[in-house]
């Protein structure tokens, strides 16, 4: 048995070693080595028992959503929907894989992550990696060089998640994004203010948003002696300073990545920084990095933002970070990320991020990668984390033992009597034609009790009692679930007043 | 009885040839990754050279390539050093080695070593 | 190459003794590392593949652990015949290397 666990072991290793190659576009020749050498790995496992030991189970970084978190996840997204739709978005949607050639050379080191699919003879196709690029295809396809849109969707990374964090392999993002040619800073300030605005609906804890500028990291690196190629390695090492010391990001940075340890001294003095507008100042009159263009061109902007910022009202809820460095490729200008914050165990302390929420930036030129004549569409947007925000949610409501309803019914229709399953076939479809939410139970002669006992349970507030008395005198029973307080309803009124009762229009508009 | 015996070390001037040989016993020898792995004395492990089952993949280390060339013959169940323009840094015990599982390159079965010294 | 590296390079310890052997590898190597004992005049051999698994005929005293980069070797209770030279080697790719060696003798 041990020297079966030993085997399968080394399949997955050898699996992941020959997946690794692929990506990282080793000769054909070790390539099909490995590939020979997994197949004969895979031969001395022999056939298997694998139908009795077939695991029924979801695949890796993959979750099934119960009742009870679609209930959470619909509630979560109508209030992002809401927030998107009162700032004057469009909604569109993509296909769920793209052509591999659209998303190549766009995500830099998480190119690694993303799902290439099995050739079905003809076109190579990868899942989606986020919601961005699809768009930026989306834009250059059609020619569009204008457009405030949404779009909420699955999307695909071959993590390793730690799904106790929210983190999974298939994924829901929230994305919203600005196109088009506007004056400096209005756009980005209006992104800002929607993801504020969302997370403060949600009401899922204190947060901060986290704003630095590409331009600003790039001179900073340049005047700090780190040579072009490097700034997008270095950028991914810097931006783990949020989850290790400043000493374990220098140590990737000279041991790993060769910078010079001077180099990163220097640059572990600006990374270091996190401030408000006053810190903009500050560098705005640093002597070497007030002398580079890109980095002043950002130091400029990112004032005027605070400035946008403050007549938002949202100025308290944001930080200029120097640390922050998205991993992305694609940002151009401004960046910002949104991270929860742990209520600190003592007064004075710092207050504790516990992972992005929410997460944006500029990327002016992703457009003009698609256009045959590079063409640039200005581009601004921000993505919703919901899947950790799903988390928190659910791990709150199950702190507070809050009961959750999954269905939307409004009234049981029930009876008193046997022999009454027609009237209430006929009284459920007055009530569906209405457009009331409706329920009854699929059985010929149910008990009064059980009916009741599943209004309890499923959170239905009323019960339409049907009985051999009330249909002689032109009746019906209404009852309320939680008060248990009985009525009789003239039939031609029932449906106004169940809708009076459960707060519903009184038409269908 | 499962096992690997090498033979053909020797001792030879710098310049010159050598061929080590290593006969295998009670396994299918063409089910598997043979390997050549020399150790300097009083030194540690050097992987040498490998070849595939099927003859088809061989690799070199950077310190023996152009000189060293490795072979087998599955009929024969023998694996093969052909040891040219050796230097005095080749002087060391040479082990066969068979690959775990078949293809994991890590050696499970082992021969006593031949030793190979390189001196004028 | 990737390099790999032993420590300490020897250890005295007696009979009963848990002993802990530590390898680094330069970049990672996943789970693709061997351990070796080799005693004055032998050949290697195997104790664990794949950073943990216990080769065939191994005592359950030894155990591997460890993926990426840092990789143990445990011997839970020495025993007389465990005095010798343990090599870790990584098979992640070509050429494939040992570390220097750890010399384990009687204290």
């Known amino acids: 048995m041990a020297e079966r666990a030993a085997l399968e072991e080394l399949v997955k290793l050898q699996g992941e070693r020959v997946r690794g190659l692929k990506q990282q576009k080793a000769s054909a020749e070790l390539i099909e080595e490995e590939v020979a050498k997994l197949l004969k790995l895979k031969a001395q496992l022999g056939p298997d028992e694998s139908k009795q030991k077939f695991v029924l189970k979801t695949p890796k970084g993959t979750r099934d959503y119960s009742p009870r978190q679609m209930a959470v996840r619909e509630k979560v997204f109508d209030v992002i929907i809401r927030c998107f739709k009162r700032h004057g978005a469009e909604v569109i949607d993509t296909p769920v894989f793209e052509l591999k050639e659209t998303l190549m050379g766009k995500y830099g080191e998480d190119s690694k992550l993303i799902y290439d699919l099995k050739d079905q003879g003809g076109e190579l196709l990868s899942l989606r990696y986020d919601l961005t690029v699809p768009f930026a295809r989306y834009l250059a396809m059609n020619k569009l060089t204008n457009i405030k849109r949404y779009h909420i969707a699955k999307v695909y990374r071959r993590d390793n998640p730690a799904m106790t964090r929210g983190r999974y392999r298939e994924f829901y993002q929230c994305d919203f994004d600005i196109a088009g040619n506007f004056d400096p800073m209005i756009p980005d300030a209006e992104c800002l203010k929607i993801m504020c605005e969302i997370l403060s609906s949600l009401q899922i804890g204190d947060f901060l948003v986290k704003v630095n500028d590409r331009r600003i990291l790039d001179g900073m690196f340049a005047i700090c002696g780190v040579s072009d190629s490097k700034f997008r390695t270095i950028c991914s090492s810097v931006d783990k300073l949020d989850k290790v010391s400043w000493e374990e990001v220098k140590n990737e940075m000279v041991g790993e990545k060769g910078l010079a340890p001077e180099v990163a001294d220097r640059i572990g003095d600006y990374v270091q920084q996190h401030g408000g507008v006053s810190l903009v100042e500050q560098l705005l009159q640093d002597p070497k990095l007030s002398q580079n263009k890109q980095a002043l061109e950002g130091l400029g902007d990112l004032k005027l933002l605070f400035e946008y910022l403050t007549l938002f009202g949202i100025d308290d809820k944001i930080s200029f970070d120097l640390s922050l460095a998205r991993g992305l490729d694609y940002y151009t200008g401004v960046i910002y990320e949104a991270v929860l914050l742990q209520t600190p165990a003592q007064a004075g302390e710092e207050p504790l991020g516990v992972g992005s929420v929410a997460a944006g930036g500029r990327y002016d030129g992703l457009v003009g990668m698609f256009d045959p004549k590079g063409r640039k569409v200005p581009c601004v947007g921000l993505s919703i984390g919901v899947e950790r925000i799903f988390s928190i949610v659910e791990q709150r409501l199950e702190a507070l033992e809050e009961k959750i309803r999954t269905t939307e019914t409004q009234v049981l229709v029930a009876s008193a009597q046997k022999k009454l399953l027609e009237e209430r076939l006929k009284l459920v479809s007055e009530l569906w034609d209405a457009g009331i939410k409706a329920e009854l139970l699929y059985k010929k002669n149910p008990k009064l009790l059980n009916q009741l006992q599943y209004c309890e349970e499923a959170g239905i507030p009323l019960v339409a009692i049907i009985g051999e008395q009330e249909l002689k005198d032109g009746v019906i029973k209404l009852r309320s679930v939680t008060s248990r307080e009985e009525v009789d309803v003239r039939r031609e009124d029932l449906v106004e007043e169940i809708k009076r009762r459960t707060g519903q229009p009184l038409c269908i508009c | 009885q499962v096992q690997l015996v090498e033979s053909g070390g020797g001792l030879v001037k710098p310049g010159g040839s050598l061929r080590l040989s290593c006969a295998a016993s009670?396994?299918?020898?063409?089910?598997?990754?043979m390997t050549w792995i020399r150790q300097a004395p009083g030194k540690g492990l050097e992987w040498v050279s490998y070849?595939?089952?099927?003859?088809?993949?061989?690799n070199y280390a950077d310190s023996v390539k152009g000189r060293f060339t490795i072979s087998r013959d599955n009929a024969k169940n023998s694996l093969y050093l052909q040891m040219n323009s050796l230097r005095d840094e080749d002087t060391a015990v040479y082990f066969c080695?068979?690959?775990?599982?078949?293809?994991?390159?890590?050696?499970?079965?082992w021969g006593q070593g031949t030793l190979v010294t390189v001196s004028s | 190459d990737i390099q790999m590296t032993q420590s300490p390079s020897s250890v005295s310890a007696s009979v009963g003794d848990r002993v802990t052997i530590t390898c680094r590898a330069s970049?990672?190597?996943?789970?693709?590392l061997a351990w070796y004992q080799q005693k004055p005049g032998r050949a290697p051999k195997l104790l664990i593949f794949?950073?943990?698994s216990l080769q065939s005929g191994v005592p359950s005293r030894f155990s591997g652990s460890g993926s990426g980069t840092h990789f143990t070797l445990t011997i839970s209770s020495l025993q007389p015949e465990d005095f010798a030279t343990y090599y870790c080697?990584?098979?992640?790719?070509?050429?494939?290397?040992f570390g220097q060696g750890t010399k384990l003798e009687i204290k």
């Open positions: 794949a950073a943990s």
């Open positions: 070849i595939s089952g099927s003859f088809r993949y061989t």
């Open positions: 970049q990672g190597i996943s789970s693709w």
């Open positions: 080697q990584q098979a992640e790719s070509f050429p494939y290397t």
């Open positions: 080695a068979r690959y775990v599982y078949q293809v994991v390159a890590i050696g499970d079965l």
């Open positions: 009670g396994f299918t020898f063409s089910d598997y990754y």
